[in-house]
């Protein structure tokens, strides 16, 4: 298990961290799954599109999102190893023109429609919290994390150490 | 520290190949993905071909069919088989990882020192 502290190094810069370019340096497509294998999904719905965790039925399709990765500058000092590295923050779009948003007041995960330049809501902190597992923390705001709450994502605050591991903010990435 | 080292580069004729290699090292936990970026002269720094870490692939659209990304996870190794090559394809060439230290479960991007490949005859 990872103390928090190590976190905390980074992601008290976040707020002060910006987009090296406009351009991600990395794109990939991916489909999403949670810690306990359930699909993240997503549907069209009264012209809007919804957000589902959910078992999928045998040789139904998962869908895929667009994965972008983006290099954030921020203090030096912020570096828990001395490692030359830039943070690295990821949007997650399903479809096109639409990303992944962190809605704070609300706690929830929205998908909204935007152009470039994304807003800061769009864009996440990646975490290897777990083996073959990564967490997403929200940029505005550190130390919340898009996790799974009542079959759906959600925020969800992480305080303590004990919680930087915990299952609903662990999400598997499959290319398959 | 996460140092990535690339080899493979050199002079080459049109139509020819080469094969390159980055090799990553030092405190990595976890490798989200490895790929290789290019730069020509005058130009922008460009994606050339990402592998994650289950095998999953990206190419750009200007070397789909002639060169090929594959990764050793156990050697935290990437290597990107380069095929009929062009003049176009004349640039420095730079290793580029997504990963996790042993200190932080941040997953940072590392880039190597980059290795030249002239195609000319």
């Known amino acids: 298990a990872f103390g928090i502290s190590g976190v905390q190094k980074y992601t008290r810069a976040l707020h002060d961290s910006s987009i090296t370019g406009i351009s991600p340096i990395t794109e990939y497509l991916a489909s999403l799954s949670t810690y306990n294998d359930q699909s993240i999904t997503f549907a069209l719905e009264d012209e809007s599109y919804e957000i589902y965790v959910e078992d999928l039925k045998k040789d139904e399709k998962k869908d895929k999102v667009l994965l972008s990765y983006y290099e954030s500058q921020h203090p030096s000092n912020e570096s828990g190893d001395g490692v030359d590295g830039k943070m690295l923050m990821v949007t997650l779009s399903p479809t096109k023109d639409f990303w992944l948003h962190a809605n704070n007041k609300e706690h929830s995960v929205e998908l909204h429609k935007c152009e470039k330049p994304l807003p800061d809501q769009a864009f996440f902190v990646l975490h290897n919290m777990h083996s073959n597992c990564v967490s997403f923390e929200c940029k505005t705001d550190p130390g919340v994390f898009i996790g799974v709450k009542d079959n759906h994502l959600a925020l969800i605050k992480v305080d303590s150490s004990e919680n930087l591991c915990t299952e609903n903010i662990l999400f598997k990435l499959s290319e398959t | 520290q996460v140092q990535l080292v690339e080899s493979g580069g050199g002079l080459v004729q049109p139509g020819g190949s080469l094969r390159l290699s980055c090799a990553a090292s030092g405190s990595i936990r976890t490798v989200n993905y490895m790929g290789w970026h290019r730069q020509a002269p005058g130009k922008q720094r460009e994606l050339v071909a990402v592998v994650t870490s289950g095998g999953g692939t990206n190419y750009a659209d200007s070397v789909k069919g002639r060169f090929t990304i594959s990764r050793d996870n156990s050697k935290n190794t990437v290597y990107l088989q380069m095929n009929s090559l062009r003049a176009e394809d004349t640039a420095v060439y730079y290793c580029?990882?997504?990963?996790?230290?042993?200190?932080?479960?941040?997953?940072?991007?590392?880039w190597g020192q980059g290795t030249l490949v002239t195609v000319s005859s």
């Open positions: 580029n990882a997504a990963a996790s230290t042993y200190s932080s479960t941040v997953v940072r991007s590392f």
